[in-house]
Amino acid sequence: MMTGTIETTGNISAEKGGSIILQCHLSSTTAQVTQVNWEQQDQLLAICNADLGWHISPSFKDRVAPGPGLGLTLQSLTVNDTGEYFCIYHTYPDGTYTGRIFLEVLESSVAEHGARFQIP
């Protein structure tokens, strides 16, 4: 029986050009984590395997860094990075657990403040 739960950072926002850490945590189970896949809308970002270590997809190599831990760091964020991200935990003997994070990439604070204090 699968007793574990995935805790994620939930809905998060970050500034364009900045970086963000995507983090999931599997709790309430003694199952062994054999692999974690990080995906973005039907696209593989990275895999962390207990035996093989990290694999970062070639198209994301310049902007994705492994860690901390089983998490993933996204760098040089663009507005196109806005969307859903999934952590898929492959465990033994439980099976697969999936967590979801929604990232919104915002224009920089300077642009925001400029708009906020405009005289109507």
């Epitope: 062994q32 692999q35 995906e39 696209q43 207990a50 093989l52 003997p93």
Partner: antibody, heavy 118, light 107 residues
């Protein structure tokens, strides 16, 4: 350099048995999932069986379930396929393959031919 | 089982041509789609994995795209050594299944 070298193929009568071996070198064998894939003469590729690295879990195609057994000996860096109750339709070149992260096959052996005929 | 349908089953092309091969899955397989090249009497060789990632050492004229059920392998400028048979394969679930293959021949 990654190398996968199959052996054990040959001519066998219907109902007979064979054991294929795949000697792996050039990488940490125990860290990788491994598979057997076959190809009948003039036909396409057909997955036969897989075995995971950390758990030893095994998976089989319906066409071979109950007749074939995949196993590994990490101390010998060797993958095996025990084939029993062989049928004419099992005639094929059998490839040993490495499966990193369980998602793709990045290295294949040169293949060993199994012919089932009376 | 997930069925993989490749088209065309064969095609004739000339050196320098742009070649496109398609693969359709009978259900969504996300990005779990790989492409292999096989030459007569040889083992298959990995070209593209996870739908769009180019395997190390493979020329950049090969590219892959798609997600869900529809995928494409493109050879931007066909070279003499590219005449071979190409297979797609899904690794979303067992049984792992391959497409029927596309034979690329010289026109």
């Amino acid at each position: 350099e990654v190398q996968l070298l199959e052996s054990g193929g040959g001519l066998v009568q219907p109902g007979g048995s064979l054991r294929l071996s795949c000697a792996a070198s050039g990488f940490t064998f125990s860290s990788y999932a491994m598979s057997w894939v076959r190809q009948a003469p003039g036909k396409g590729l057909e997955w036969v069986a897989s075995i995971k690295s950390s758990t030893g879990y095994t998976y089989y195609a319906d066409s071979v379930k109950g007749r074939f057994t995949i196993s590994r000996d990490n101390s010998k860096n060797t993958l095996y396929l025990q084939m029993n109750s062989l049928r004419a339709e099992d005639t094929a070149v059998y490839y040993c393959a490495r499966v990193p992260y369980g998602v793709w096959i990045d290295y294949w052996g040169q293949g060993t031919l199994v012919t089932v005929s009376s | 089982d997930i069925q993989m349908t490749q088209s065309p089953s064969s095609l004739s092309a000339s050196v320098g041509d742009r070649v496109t091969i398609t693969c359709r899955a009978s259900q969504s397989i996300s990005y779990y789609l790989n492409w292999y090249q096989q030459k007569p009497g040889k083992a298959p060789k990995l070209l593209i994995y996870a739908a769009s990632s180019l395997q190390s050492g493979v020329p950049s004229r090969f590219s892959g795209s798609g997600s869900g059920t529809d995928f494409t392998l493109t050879i931007s400028s066909l070279q003499p050594e590219d005449f071979a048979t190409y297979y797609c394969q899904q690794s979303y679930s067992t049984p792992l299944t391959f497409g029927g293959g596309t034979k690329v021949e010289i026109k």
